[in-house]
Protein backbone atom coordinates (compact mmCIF):
# COMPACT_ATOMS: atom_id res chain seq x y z
CA UNK A 1 0.00 0.00 0.00
CA UNK A 2 1.30 3.48 -0.88
CA UNK A 3 1.96 5.70 2.12
CA UNK A 4 0.23 9.05 2.03
CA UNK A 5 2.16 12.25 2.80
CA UNK A 6 1.51 13.82 6.20
CA UNK A 7 -0.68 16.94 6.02
CA UNK A 8 -1.37 20.15 7.89
CA UNK A 9 2.14 20.89 9.16
CA UNK A 10 2.28 23.67 11.73
CA UNK A 11 5.43 25.52 12.72
CA UNK A 12 5.37 27.00 16.24
CA UNK A 13 8.24 29.20 17.29
CA UNK A 14 8.33 30.60 20.79
CA UNK A 15 11.57 32.45 21.62
CA UNK A 16 14.30 30.00 20.55
CA UNK A 17 12.05 26.92 20.60
CA UNK A 18 11.16 25.57 17.16
CA UNK A 19 8.36 22.99 17.23
CA UNK A 20 6.76 21.17 14.32
CA UNK A 21 3.34 19.49 14.51
CA UNK A 22 1.53 17.58 11.78
CA UNK A 23 -1.35 15.23 11.14
CA UNK A 24 -0.99 11.58 10.14
CA UNK A 25 -2.72 11.16 6.84
CA UNK A 26 -3.53 7.51 7.44
CA UNK A 27 -4.32 6.54 11.02
CA UNK A 28 -4.82 2.88 10.08
CA UNK A 29 -1.17 2.35 9.17
CA UNK A 30 0.96 1.54 12.23
CA UNK A 31 4.68 1.91 12.93
CA UNK A 32 5.06 4.88 10.60
CA UNK A 33 7.93 7.31 11.16
CA UNK A 34 8.30 10.83 9.81
CA UNK A 35 11.31 12.77 8.61
CA UNK A 36 11.88 16.41 7.64
CA UNK A 37 14.31 18.15 5.32
CA UNK A 38 14.96 21.85 5.14
CA UNK A 39 16.22 24.18 2.45
CA UNK A 40 17.66 27.66 2.85
CA UNK A 41 16.84 30.47 0.43
CA UNK A 42 19.01 30.42 -2.66
CA UNK A 43 20.04 26.78 -2.19
CA UNK A 44 18.91 23.89 -4.35
CA UNK A 45 19.84 21.02 -2.08
CA UNK A 46 17.71 19.76 0.80
CA UNK A 47 19.35 19.00 4.17
CA UNK A 48 18.13 16.54 6.78
CA UNK A 49 16.55 18.45 9.68
CA UNK A 50 18.35 17.29 12.81
CA UNK A 51 15.98 16.44 15.67
CA UNK A 52 13.25 15.63 13.16
CA UNK A 53 14.36 12.32 11.63
CA UNK A 54 12.50 9.02 12.02
CA UNK A 55 10.02 10.49 14.47
CA UNK A 56 7.28 8.14 15.68
CA UNK A 57 5.03 10.87 17.14
CA UNK A 58 3.50 13.84 15.29
CA UNK A 59 5.67 16.48 16.91
CA UNK A 60 9.36 17.31 16.82
CA UNK A 61 11.73 19.97 18.06
CA UNK A 62 14.44 21.46 15.86
CA UNK A 63 15.68 24.14 18.28
CA UNK A 64 19.23 22.79 18.12
CA UNK A 65 19.52 23.83 14.48
CA UNK A 66 21.48 27.08 14.33
CA UNK A 67 19.48 29.05 11.78
CA UNK A 68 19.76 32.64 10.68
CA UNK A 69 16.40 33.74 12.09
CA UNK A 70 16.05 36.49 9.46
CA UNK A 71 16.52 34.12 6.53
CA UNK A 72 13.64 32.36 4.82
CA UNK A 73 13.58 28.56 5.03
CA UNK A 74 11.46 25.84 3.48
CA UNK A 75 10.56 22.48 5.05
CA UNK A 76 9.30 19.23 3.65
CA UNK A 77 8.04 16.07 5.38
CA UNK A 78 7.42 12.48 4.39
CA UNK A 79 6.15 9.33 6.04
CA UNK A 80 8.29 6.19 6.13
CA UNK A 81 7.56 2.52 6.72
CA UNK A 82 8.96 -0.12 4.35
CA UNK A 83 8.61 2.45 1.60
CA UNK A 84 8.21 6.22 1.78
CA UNK A 85 5.46 8.67 0.91
CA UNK A 86 5.99 11.56 -1.46
CA UNK A 87 7.32 14.74 0.11
CA UNK A 88 4.86 17.30 1.42
CA UNK A 89 6.28 20.82 1.19
CA UNK A 90 5.47 23.36 3.88
CA UNK A 91 5.10 27.03 2.89
CA UNK A 92 8.41 28.82 3.30
CA UNK A 93 8.73 31.10 6.31
CA UNK A 94 11.16 33.44 8.08
CA UNK A 95 11.68 32.30 11.67
CA UNK A 96 11.80 35.83 13.10
CA UNK A 97 8.51 36.76 11.46
CA UNK A 98 6.83 33.61 12.67
CA UNK A 99 8.24 33.70 16.19
CA UNK A 100 6.18 34.55 19.23
CA UNK A 101 7.60 36.06 22.39
CA UNK A 102 7.46 33.51 25.16
CA UNK A 103 6.20 34.10 28.69
CA UNK A 104 8.56 36.29 30.72
CA UNK A 105 10.00 35.31 34.07
CA UNK A 106 8.43 37.18 36.97
CA UNK A 107 9.82 37.79 40.42
CA UNK A 108 7.75 39.51 43.11
CA UNK A 109 8.59 41.35 46.31
CA UNK A 110 5.99 42.62 48.75
CA UNK A 111 5.71 45.61 51.04
CA UNK A 112 2.65 46.55 53.08
CA UNK A 113 0.97 48.63 50.37
CA UNK A 114 3.13 47.95 47.33
CA UNK A 115 4.48 45.15 45.17
CA UNK A 116 7.73 45.23 43.24
CA UNK A 117 7.72 43.25 40.01
CA UNK A 118 10.97 42.19 38.36
CA UNK A 119 10.48 40.96 34.81
CA UNK A 120 13.03 39.29 32.58
CA UNK A 121 12.79 37.51 29.22
CA UNK A 122 11.81 33.86 29.52
CA UNK A 123 14.77 32.77 27.40
CA UNK A 124 18.13 34.07 28.58
CA UNK A 125 20.43 35.34 25.80
CA UNK A 126 17.83 34.49 23.19
CA UNK A 127 19.10 34.26 19.62
CA UNK A 128 15.67 35.20 18.26
CA UNK A 129 15.54 38.51 20.13
CA UNK A 130 19.29 39.23 20.22
CA UNK A 131 18.88 42.46 18.24
CA UNK A 132 15.65 43.46 19.98
CA UNK A 133 16.32 42.60 23.62
CA UNK A 134 16.61 46.25 24.57
CA UNK A 135 13.23 47.04 23.03
CA UNK A 136 11.05 44.77 25.17
CA UNK A 137 8.25 46.43 27.04
CA UNK A 138 5.81 44.61 29.24
CA UNK A 139 2.19 44.82 30.23
CA UNK A 140 0.50 43.14 33.12
CA UNK A 141 -2.90 42.26 34.49
CA UNK A 142 -3.28 42.39 38.28
CA UNK A 143 -6.21 41.50 40.51
CA UNK A 144 -7.03 40.93 44.16
CA UNK A 145 -7.26 37.20 44.66
CA UNK A 146 -10.51 37.68 46.58
CA UNK A 147 -12.31 39.82 43.99
CA UNK A 148 -10.92 38.94 40.57
CA UNK A 149 -11.49 42.50 39.28
CA UNK A 150 -8.65 43.01 36.81
CA UNK A 151 -6.57 46.10 36.28
CA UNK A 152 -4.31 46.40 33.23
CA UNK A 153 -1.02 48.24 33.27
CA UNK A 154 0.65 48.87 29.91
CA UNK A 155 4.14 49.85 28.80
CA UNK A 156 6.17 48.98 31.85
CA UNK A 157 9.83 48.08 32.01
CA UNK A 158 11.80 45.30 33.64
CA UNK A 159 11.19 46.58 37.14
CA UNK A 160 7.85 48.05 38.11
CA UNK A 161 6.35 49.01 41.45
CA UNK A 162 2.62 49.08 42.05
CA UNK A 163 1.52 51.33 44.91
CA UNK A 164 -1.68 52.06 46.81
CA UNK A 165 -2.44 48.42 47.56
CA UNK A 166 -4.09 47.04 50.69
CA UNK A 167 -2.02 45.43 53.48
CA UNK A 168 -2.35 41.71 54.18
CA UNK A 169 -4.01 41.07 50.82
CA UNK A 170 -3.13 38.51 48.18
CA UNK A 171 -2.67 39.96 44.70
CA UNK A 172 -2.22 37.89 41.57
CA UNK A 173 -0.78 39.00 38.28
CA UNK A 174 0.40 37.81 34.90
CA UNK A 175 2.81 39.55 32.56
CA UNK A 176 3.44 39.50 28.84
CA UNK A 177 6.17 41.04 26.73
CA UNK A 178 5.87 43.09 23.57
CA UNK A 179 8.25 44.18 20.85
CA UNK A 180 6.50 47.23 19.54
CA UNK A 181 9.16 47.71 16.86
CA UNK A 182 8.11 44.39 15.30
CA UNK A 183 4.42 44.48 16.20
CA UNK A 184 4.82 41.40 18.35
CA UNK A 185 2.80 40.71 21.47
CA UNK A 186 3.95 37.83 23.64
CA UNK A 187 2.36 35.05 25.62
CA UNK A 188 1.30 35.67 29.22
CA UNK A 189 3.44 34.30 32.03
CA UNK A 190 1.87 31.87 34.48
CA UNK A 191 -0.09 33.61 37.23
CA UNK A 192 2.05 34.70 40.18
CA UNK A 193 0.52 35.62 43.54
CA UNK A 194 1.96 37.40 46.57
CA UNK A 195 0.50 38.67 49.82
CA UNK A 196 1.26 42.19 50.99
CA UNK A 197 2.61 42.41 54.53
CA UNK A 198 0.97 43.72 57.67
CA UNK A 199 0.76 47.51 57.69
CA UNK A 200 4.08 49.09 58.56
CA UNK A 201 4.24 51.19 61.73
CA UNK A 202 5.61 54.13 59.79
CA UNK A 203 3.93 55.16 56.54
CA UNK A 204 6.10 56.38 53.67
CA UNK A 205 6.38 60.13 53.01
CA UNK A 206 3.82 61.50 50.54
CA UNK A 207 3.22 64.36 48.11
CA UNK A 208 6.82 64.94 47.13
CA UNK A 209 7.33 68.15 45.19
CA UNK A 210 10.35 69.92 43.77
CA UNK A 211 10.57 73.65 43.22
CA UNK A 212 13.33 76.05 42.28
CA UNK A 213 14.49 78.86 44.54
CA UNK A 214 17.45 80.95 43.45
CA UNK A 215 20.18 78.47 42.49
CA UNK A 216 18.71 75.69 44.64
CA UNK A 217 16.15 72.95 44.34
CA UNK A 218 13.71 72.72 47.22
CA UNK A 219 12.29 69.27 47.83
CA UNK A 220 9.21 69.12 50.07
CA UNK A 221 7.02 66.27 51.26
CA UNK A 222 4.27 65.55 53.77
CA UNK A 223 4.60 63.31 56.77
CA UNK A 224 2.16 62.08 59.37
CA UNK A 225 4.39 62.21 62.46
CA UNK A 226 6.79 64.68 64.02
CA UNK A 227 10.35 64.13 65.29
CA UNK A 228 11.42 62.02 62.30
CA UNK A 229 14.54 61.97 60.18
CA UNK A 230 14.37 61.61 56.42
CA UNK A 231 16.68 60.59 53.62
CA UNK A 232 16.28 61.25 49.91
CA UNK A 233 17.73 59.20 47.06
CA UNK A 234 17.91 59.71 43.31
CA UNK A 235 18.28 57.51 40.25
CA UNK A 236 18.73 58.23 36.55
CA UNK A 237 15.30 57.59 35.02
CA UNK A 238 16.76 55.96 31.89
CA UNK A 239 18.07 53.06 34.01
CA UNK A 240 14.48 51.89 34.39
CA UNK A 241 14.40 51.19 30.66
CA UNK A 242 17.45 48.94 30.70
CA UNK A 243 15.98 45.43 30.52
CA UNK A 244 19.05 43.67 31.84
CA UNK A 245 19.29 45.89 34.88
CA UNK A 246 17.66 44.57 38.02
CA UNK A 247 19.95 46.45 40.36
CA UNK A 248 19.04 50.09 40.76
CA UNK A 249 21.88 51.94 42.36
CA UNK A 250 19.96 54.66 44.13
CA UNK A 251 22.21 57.49 45.32
CA UNK A 252 21.95 59.73 48.35
CA UNK A 253 21.47 63.47 47.94
CA UNK A 254 24.14 64.61 50.42
CA UNK A 255 22.14 67.63 51.70
CA UNK A 256 19.09 65.42 52.18
CA UNK A 257 20.56 62.71 54.37
CA UNK A 258 19.17 62.52 57.89
CA UNK A 259 17.21 65.76 57.61
CA UNK A 260 14.85 66.53 60.48
CA UNK A 261 12.39 68.65 58.49
CA UNK A 262 9.94 67.70 55.74
CA UNK A 263 12.00 69.52 53.17
CA UNK A 264 15.57 69.80 52.03
CA UNK A 265 17.44 72.29 49.91
CA UNK A 266 20.29 71.36 47.59
CA UNK A 267 22.20 73.19 44.86
CA UNK A 268 20.98 72.87 41.27
CA UNK A 269 24.44 71.72 40.23
CA UNK A 270 23.92 68.46 42.14
CA UNK A 271 22.08 67.28 39.01
CA UNK A 272 23.23 67.60 35.44
CA UNK A 273 20.53 68.11 32.81
CA UNK A 274 18.34 65.04 32.66
CA UNK A 275 15.41 63.14 34.07
CA UNK A 276 15.72 61.61 37.51
CA UNK A 277 13.60 59.65 39.95
CA UNK A 278 13.46 60.76 43.57
CA UNK A 279 12.26 58.89 46.64
CA UNK A 280 12.08 59.67 50.36
CA UNK A 281 12.19 57.45 53.44
CA UNK A 282 11.31 58.27 57.05
CA UNK A 283 12.83 56.92 60.25
CA UNK A 284 12.18 57.50 63.95
CA UNK A 285 15.46 55.95 65.07
CA UNK A 286 13.96 52.53 65.75
CA UNK A 287 11.74 51.95 62.75
CA UNK A 288 12.03 52.89 59.11
CA UNK A 289 9.27 53.45 56.59
CA UNK A 290 9.21 51.85 53.17
CA UNK A 291 10.29 54.22 50.43
CA UNK A 292 7.81 56.76 49.13
CA UNK A 293 6.40 56.58 45.65
CA UNK A 294 9.08 57.58 43.16
CA UNK A 295 8.54 60.93 41.50
CA UNK A 296 9.96 61.88 38.16
CA UNK A 297 12.05 65.02 38.16
CA UNK A 298 13.13 66.69 34.90
CA UNK A 299 15.75 69.39 35.42
CA UNK A 300 14.70 71.12 32.20
CA UNK A 301 11.03 71.29 33.07
CA UNK A 302 11.83 72.13 36.66
CA UNK A 303 13.82 75.14 35.63
CA UNK A 304 11.58 76.33 32.85
CA UNK A 305 7.95 75.55 33.60
CA UNK A 306 6.87 79.17 33.68
CA UNK A 307 3.33 80.50 34.05
CA UNK A 308 1.43 80.85 30.77
CA UNK A 309 0.89 84.19 29.08
CA UNK A 310 -2.66 84.85 27.82
CA UNK A 311 -4.87 87.41 26.09
CA UNK A 312 -8.56 87.89 26.79
CA UNK A 313 -11.21 88.81 24.24
CA UNK A 314 -14.27 89.97 26.11
CA UNK A 315 -17.84 89.27 24.97
CA UNK A 316 -21.07 89.98 26.81
CA UNK A 317 -21.51 86.48 28.28
CA UNK A 318 -18.05 84.96 27.94
CA UNK A 319 -14.32 85.47 27.68
CA UNK A 320 -12.20 83.95 24.94
CA UNK A 321 -8.74 83.26 26.36
CA UNK A 322 -5.78 82.70 24.06
CA UNK A 323 -2.81 81.09 25.80
CA UNK A 324 0.66 81.76 24.45
CA UNK A 325 4.18 80.61 25.33
CA UNK A 326 5.59 82.18 28.49
CA UNK A 327 8.25 84.85 28.09
CA UNK A 328 11.79 84.70 29.39
CA UNK A 329 13.48 87.73 30.93
CA UNK A 330 14.55 88.96 27.46
CA UNK A 331 10.88 88.85 26.33
CA UNK A 332 11.60 85.85 24.08
CA UNK A 333 9.05 83.02 24.21
CA UNK A 334 10.07 79.79 25.94
CA UNK A 335 9.68 76.73 23.72
CA UNK A 336 8.10 73.98 25.81
CA UNK A 337 8.15 70.79 23.80
CA UNK A 338 6.26 68.66 26.30
CA UNK A 339 2.46 68.51 26.52
CA UNK A 340 0.88 70.87 29.03
CA UNK A 341 -2.53 71.19 30.56
CA UNK A 342 -3.84 74.59 31.65
CA UNK A 343 -5.72 75.46 34.81
CA UNK A 344 -7.69 78.68 34.52
CA UNK A 345 -9.21 80.26 37.60
CA UNK A 346 -11.70 83.11 37.24
CA UNK A 347 -13.87 85.08 39.61
CA UNK A 348 -16.05 88.16 39.78
CA UNK A 349 -13.93 91.05 40.95
CA UNK A 350 -16.35 91.80 43.78
CA UNK A 351 -16.52 88.19 44.98
CA UNK A 352 -14.20 85.52 46.34
CA UNK A 353 -16.04 82.65 44.68
CA UNK A 354 -13.55 81.14 42.25
CA UNK A 355 -14.42 78.89 39.35
CA UNK A 356 -11.96 76.60 37.60
CA UNK A 357 -11.50 75.30 34.05
CA UNK A 358 -8.95 72.63 33.09
CA UNK A 359 -8.13 72.60 29.38
CA UNK A 360 -5.54 71.04 27.07
CA UNK A 361 -6.24 73.52 24.25
CA UNK A 362 -4.60 76.92 24.07
CA UNK A 363 -7.84 78.69 23.20
CA UNK A 364 -10.41 78.48 25.95
CA UNK A 365 -13.91 79.84 26.34
CA UNK A 366 -15.03 80.92 29.80
CA UNK A 367 -18.84 80.72 29.53
CA UNK A 368 -21.84 81.94 31.56
CA UNK A 369 -20.57 85.41 32.49
CA UNK A 370 -22.77 88.40 33.30
CA UNK A 371 -22.64 91.43 30.99
CA UNK A 372 -20.82 94.60 32.10
CA UNK A 373 -19.14 92.81 34.98
CA UNK A 374 -15.46 92.80 35.87
CA UNK A 375 -13.97 89.32 36.03
CA UNK A 376 -10.40 88.40 36.92
CA UNK A 377 -8.47 85.51 35.43
CA UNK A 378 -5.25 83.77 36.36
CA UNK A 379 -3.73 80.63 34.87
CA UNK A 380 -1.03 78.08 35.46
CA UNK A 381 0.44 75.19 33.48
CA UNK A 382 0.78 71.55 34.55
CA UNK A 383 2.77 68.82 32.85
CA UNK A 384 0.54 66.01 31.61
CA UNK A 385 2.90 63.25 32.74
CA UNK A 386 1.42 62.05 36.02
CA UNK A 387 4.83 61.01 37.36
CA UNK A 388 6.39 64.41 36.70
CA UNK A 389 3.44 66.13 38.32
CA UNK A 390 4.98 69.58 37.86
CA UNK A 391 3.05 72.83 37.96
CA UNK A 392 4.05 76.39 37.23
CA UNK A 393 3.10 79.17 39.60
CA UNK A 394 -0.05 81.10 38.70
CA UNK A 395 0.27 84.02 36.33
CA UNK A 396 -0.61 87.46 37.59
CA UNK A 397 -4.37 88.04 37.56
CA UNK A 398 -5.78 89.94 34.58
CA UNK A 399 -9.14 91.68 35.07
CA UNK A 400 -11.51 92.58 32.22
CA UNK A 401 -15.07 93.82 31.95
CA UNK A 402 -17.61 91.91 29.86
CA UNK A 403 -19.40 93.73 27.04
CA UNK A 404 -23.00 94.97 27.23
CA UNK A 405 -25.73 92.38 26.83
CA UNK A 406 -26.44 92.68 23.11
CA UNK A 407 -22.96 91.71 21.87
CA UNK A 408 -22.62 88.01 21.84
CA UNK A 409 -20.61 87.86 18.61
Amino acid sequence: KNLKSPQKVEVDIIDDNFILRWNRSDESVGNVTFSFDYQKTGMDNWIKLSGCQNITSTKCNFSSLKLNVYEEIKLRIRAEKENTSSWYEVDSFTPFRKAQIGPPEVHLEAEDKAIVIHISPGTKDSVMWALDGLSFTYSLVIWKNSSGVEERIENIYSRHKIYKLSPETTYCLKVKAALLTSWKIGVYSPVHCIKTTVENELPPPENIEVSVQNQNYVLKWDYTYANMTFQVQWLHAFLKRNPGNHLYKWKQIPDCENVKTTQCVFPQNVFQKGIYLLRVQASDGNNTSFWSEEIKFDTEIQAFLLPPVFNIRSLSDSFHIYIGAPKQSGNTPVIQDYPLIYEIIFWENTSNAERKIIEKKTDVTVPNLKPLTVYCVKARAHTMDEKLNKSSVFSDAVCEKTKPGNTSK
Epitope: E109, H118, N245, L247
Partner: antibody, heavy 117, light 107 residues
Framework: EVQLQQSGAELVKPGASVKLSCSAS????????IHWVKQRTEQGLEWIGR????????KYAPKFQAKATITADTSSNTAYLQLNSLTSEDTAVYYC???????????WGQGSTLTVS | DIVMTQSQKSMSTSLGDRVTVTCKAS??????VAWYQLKPGQSPKTLIY???YRSSGVPDRFTGSGSGTDFTLTISNVQSEDLAEYFC?????????FGSGTKLEIR
Protein backbone atom coordinates in the same frame (compact mmCIF):
# COMPACT_ATOMS: atom_id res chain seq x y z
CA GLU B 1 31.62 31.50 34.52
CA VAL B 2 31.19 33.90 37.44
CA GLN B 3 33.95 33.68 40.05
CA LEU B 4 35.19 35.72 42.99
CA GLN B 5 38.80 34.83 43.78
CA GLN B 6 40.05 36.09 47.13
CA SER B 7 43.62 36.63 48.30
CA GLY B 8 45.31 34.06 50.52
CA ALA B 9 45.64 33.72 54.28
CA GLU B 10 47.33 36.53 56.21
CA LEU B 11 49.15 36.43 59.53
CA VAL B 12 49.71 39.94 60.90
CA LYS B 13 50.75 41.62 64.13
CA PRO B 14 48.36 43.59 66.34
CA GLY B 15 48.21 47.28 65.42
CA ALA B 16 49.12 46.64 61.79
CA SER B 17 46.88 46.96 58.71
CA VAL B 18 45.98 44.48 56.01
CA LYS B 19 44.41 44.72 52.57
CA LEU B 20 42.41 41.77 51.27
CA SER B 21 41.49 41.47 47.61
CA CYS B 22 38.56 39.98 45.72
CA SER B 23 39.16 39.52 42.01
CA ALA B 24 36.06 39.05 39.85
CA SER B 25 35.75 37.19 36.57
CA UNK B 26 32.77 36.38 34.36
CA UNK B 27 31.07 39.74 35.04
CA UNK B 28 31.88 43.41 35.32
CA UNK B 29 31.99 44.66 38.91
CA UNK B 30 30.76 48.07 37.71
CA UNK B 31 27.33 46.48 37.15
CA UNK B 32 27.09 45.27 40.73
CA UNK B 33 27.77 46.02 44.37
CA ILE B 34 30.55 44.12 46.11
CA HIS B 35 29.92 43.33 49.79
CA TRP B 36 32.28 42.12 52.50
CA VAL B 37 31.21 39.76 55.31
CA LYS B 38 33.11 38.66 58.42
CA GLN B 39 32.88 35.24 60.01
CA ARG B 40 34.62 34.51 63.30
CA THR B 41 35.08 30.95 64.59
CA GLU B 42 31.94 29.75 66.34
CA GLN B 43 30.30 33.08 65.60
CA GLY B 44 27.82 34.13 62.96
CA LEU B 45 28.10 36.22 59.83
CA GLU B 46 28.57 39.96 60.14
CA TRP B 47 28.07 42.43 57.31
CA ILE B 48 30.97 44.87 57.06
CA GLY B 49 29.89 47.04 54.15
CA ARG B 50 29.65 47.35 50.40
CA UNK B 51 30.97 49.39 47.50
CA UNK B 52 29.50 50.55 44.23
CA UNK B 53 32.59 50.07 42.05
CA UNK B 54 31.14 52.34 39.37
CA UNK B 55 31.62 55.49 41.47
CA UNK B 56 33.31 54.28 44.67
CA UNK B 57 30.30 55.01 46.89
CA UNK B 58 30.44 52.93 50.08
CA LYS B 59 28.13 51.97 52.95
CA TYR B 60 29.38 50.47 56.21
CA ALA B 61 27.87 48.82 59.25
CA PRO B 62 28.30 51.31 62.13
CA LYS B 63 30.53 48.83 63.95
CA PHE B 64 33.04 48.75 61.05
CA GLN B 65 32.97 52.43 60.10
CA ALA B 66 36.34 53.16 61.71
CA LYS B 67 37.83 49.73 61.13
CA ALA B 68 37.24 48.99 57.44
CA THR B 69 37.83 50.75 54.14
CA ILE B 70 36.38 49.22 50.98
CA THR B 71 37.77 50.25 47.60
CA ALA B 72 37.59 48.94 44.05
CA ASP B 73 39.70 49.08 40.91
CA THR B 74 37.46 48.67 37.88
CA SER B 75 40.41 48.31 35.50
CA SER B 76 41.43 45.06 37.21
CA ASN B 77 37.83 44.12 38.17
CA THR B 78 38.91 43.82 41.79
CA ALA B 79 37.50 44.97 45.13
CA TYR B 80 39.54 45.45 48.29
CA LEU B 81 38.93 45.43 52.02
CA GLN B 82 41.47 47.25 54.18
CA LEU B 83 41.37 46.66 57.93
CA ASN B 84 43.41 48.88 60.21
CA SER B 85 44.56 48.91 63.87
CA LEU B 86 44.19 45.16 63.98
CA THR B 87 43.45 43.29 67.20
CA SER B 88 42.73 39.65 67.98
CA GLU B 89 39.02 40.47 67.53
CA ASP B 90 39.73 40.89 63.82
CA THR B 91 40.88 37.28 63.49
CA ALA B 92 38.28 35.81 61.17
CA VAL B 93 37.46 34.62 57.68
CA TYR B 94 36.44 37.50 55.39
CA TYR B 95 34.21 36.85 52.40
CA CYS B 96 33.38 39.03 49.46
CA UNK B 97 30.05 38.55 47.72
CA UNK B 98 28.48 40.15 44.71
CA UNK B 99 25.04 41.73 44.50
CA UNK B 100 23.94 42.30 40.92
CA UNK B 101 20.17 41.96 41.10
CA UNK B 102 17.30 40.84 43.30
CA UNK B 103 19.10 37.53 43.94
CA UNK B 104 21.25 39.51 46.35
CA UNK B 105 24.43 37.61 47.37
CA UNK B 106 24.31 35.09 44.56
CA UNK B 107 28.09 34.43 44.36
CA TRP B 108 30.63 34.40 47.18
CA GLY B 109 34.41 34.32 47.26
CA GLN B 110 36.13 31.36 48.89
CA GLY B 111 37.12 33.47 51.90
CA SER B 112 40.39 34.97 53.16
CA THR B 113 41.61 33.89 56.59
CA LEU B 114 43.11 36.68 58.69
CA THR B 115 44.99 35.82 61.85
CA VAL B 116 46.10 38.64 64.16
CA SER B 117 48.75 37.38 66.53
CA ASP C 1 19.15 49.11 63.25
CA ILE C 2 16.96 46.15 62.46
CA VAL C 3 17.55 43.00 64.55
CA MET C 4 17.07 39.54 63.02
CA THR C 5 16.37 37.05 65.80
CA GLN C 6 16.92 33.32 65.29
CA SER C 7 15.72 32.09 68.67
CA GLN C 8 16.90 28.48 68.24
CA LYS C 9 20.69 28.36 68.43
CA SER C 10 20.63 24.69 67.43
CA MET C 11 18.11 22.07 66.40
CA SER C 12 18.27 18.31 66.53
CA THR C 13 16.65 16.27 63.80
CA SER C 14 16.70 12.82 62.26
CA LEU C 15 17.46 12.03 58.65
CA GLY C 16 14.28 12.14 56.57
CA ASP C 17 12.54 14.47 59.04
CA ARG C 18 11.08 17.86 58.30
CA VAL C 19 12.59 20.80 60.16
CA THR C 20 11.61 24.48 60.37
CA VAL C 21 14.09 27.25 61.15
CA THR C 22 12.53 30.56 62.19
CA CYS C 23 13.69 34.14 62.01
CA LYS C 24 12.01 37.26 63.36
CA ALA C 25 12.76 40.82 62.19
CA SER C 26 12.42 43.69 64.66
CA UNK C 27 10.46 45.65 62.06
CA UNK C 28 8.63 45.07 58.79
CA UNK C 29 11.15 44.25 56.05
CA UNK C 30 8.63 43.24 53.40
CA UNK C 31 9.87 40.08 51.70
CA UNK C 32 13.47 41.22 51.39
CA VAL C 33 14.96 38.31 53.32
CA ALA C 34 17.50 35.68 52.28
CA TRP C 35 18.63 32.39 53.84
CA TYR C 36 22.20 31.09 53.71
CA GLN C 37 23.75 27.73 54.52
CA LEU C 38 27.21 27.69 56.07
CA LYS C 39 29.33 24.57 56.42
CA PRO C 40 32.74 24.52 58.15
CA GLY C 41 35.56 25.47 55.78
CA GLN C 42 33.17 26.47 53.00
CA SER C 43 31.75 29.74 51.68
CA PRO C 44 28.16 30.55 52.54
CA LYS C 45 25.65 29.24 50.03
CA THR C 46 22.54 31.23 49.11
CA LEU C 47 19.46 29.04 49.51
CA ILE C 48 16.52 31.45 49.40
CA TYR C 49 16.12 35.08 48.37
CA UNK C 50 13.11 37.42 48.48
CA UNK C 51 11.74 35.25 51.31
CA UNK C 52 10.49 32.43 49.12
CA TYR C 53 12.51 32.12 45.90
CA ARG C 54 14.89 29.18 45.71
CA SER C 55 18.38 29.91 44.36
CA SER C 56 19.38 27.95 41.28
CA GLY C 57 20.74 24.50 42.04
CA VAL C 58 19.15 24.39 45.50
CA PRO C 59 17.13 21.19 46.07
CA ASP C 60 13.38 21.69 46.32
CA ARG C 61 13.32 20.25 49.81
CA PHE C 62 14.37 23.76 50.92
CA THR C 63 11.41 26.14 51.13
CA GLY C 64 11.27 29.73 52.34
CA SER C 65 8.15 31.53 53.47
CA GLY C 66 6.96 34.54 55.44
CA SER C 67 6.74 38.28 55.08
CA GLY C 68 6.80 41.40 57.23
CA THR C 69 8.53 40.27 60.41
CA ASP C 70 8.21 36.46 60.53
CA PHE C 71 10.16 34.18 58.23
CA THR C 72 10.79 30.45 58.06
CA LEU C 73 13.11 28.10 56.25
CA THR C 74 11.69 24.58 56.00
CA ILE C 75 13.83 21.58 55.10
CA SER C 76 11.72 18.53 54.33
CA ASN C 77 13.30 15.08 54.18
CA VAL C 78 16.54 16.18 55.86
CA GLN C 79 19.68 14.67 54.29
CA SER C 80 23.11 14.26 55.90
CA GLU C 81 24.52 16.99 53.65
CA ASP C 82 22.03 19.46 55.21
CA LEU C 83 23.92 19.43 58.50
CA ALA C 84 25.12 23.01 58.64
CA GLU C 85 24.39 26.39 60.15
CA TYR C 86 21.56 28.45 58.65
CA PHE C 87 21.43 32.25 58.67
CA CYS C 88 18.63 34.59 57.72
CA UNK C 89 19.47 38.07 56.43
CA UNK C 90 17.49 41.23 55.77
CA UNK C 91 18.59 43.46 52.93
CA UNK C 92 15.64 45.83 52.81
CA UNK C 93 17.61 48.57 54.57
CA UNK C 94 21.20 49.40 55.41
CA UNK C 95 22.94 48.14 57.39
CA UNK C 96 22.40 44.63 56.05
CA UNK C 97 21.79 42.37 59.04
CA PHE C 98 22.26 38.62 59.48
CA GLY C 99 20.52 36.53 62.11
CA SER C 100 22.70 34.86 64.73
CA GLY C 101 22.37 31.46 63.05
CA THR C 102 20.74 28.09 63.77
CA LYS C 103 22.86 24.92 63.78
CA LEU C 104 21.21 21.80 62.44
CA GLU C 105 22.43 18.63 64.13
CA ILE C 106 21.55 14.95 63.71
CA ARG C 107 20.14 13.04 66.67
Amino acid sequence: EVQLQQSGAELVKPGASVKLSCSASGFNIKDCYIHWVKQRTEQGLEWIGRIDPEDGETKYAPKFQAKATITADTSSNTAYLQLNSLTSEDTAVYYCARHCNFLYFDYWGQGSTLTVS
Amino acid sequence: DIVMTQSQKSMSTSLGDRVTVTCKASQNVGTIVAWYQLKPGQSPKTLIYSASYRSSGVPDRFTGSGSGTDFTLTISNVQSEDLAEYFCQQYNNYPVIFGSGTKLEIR
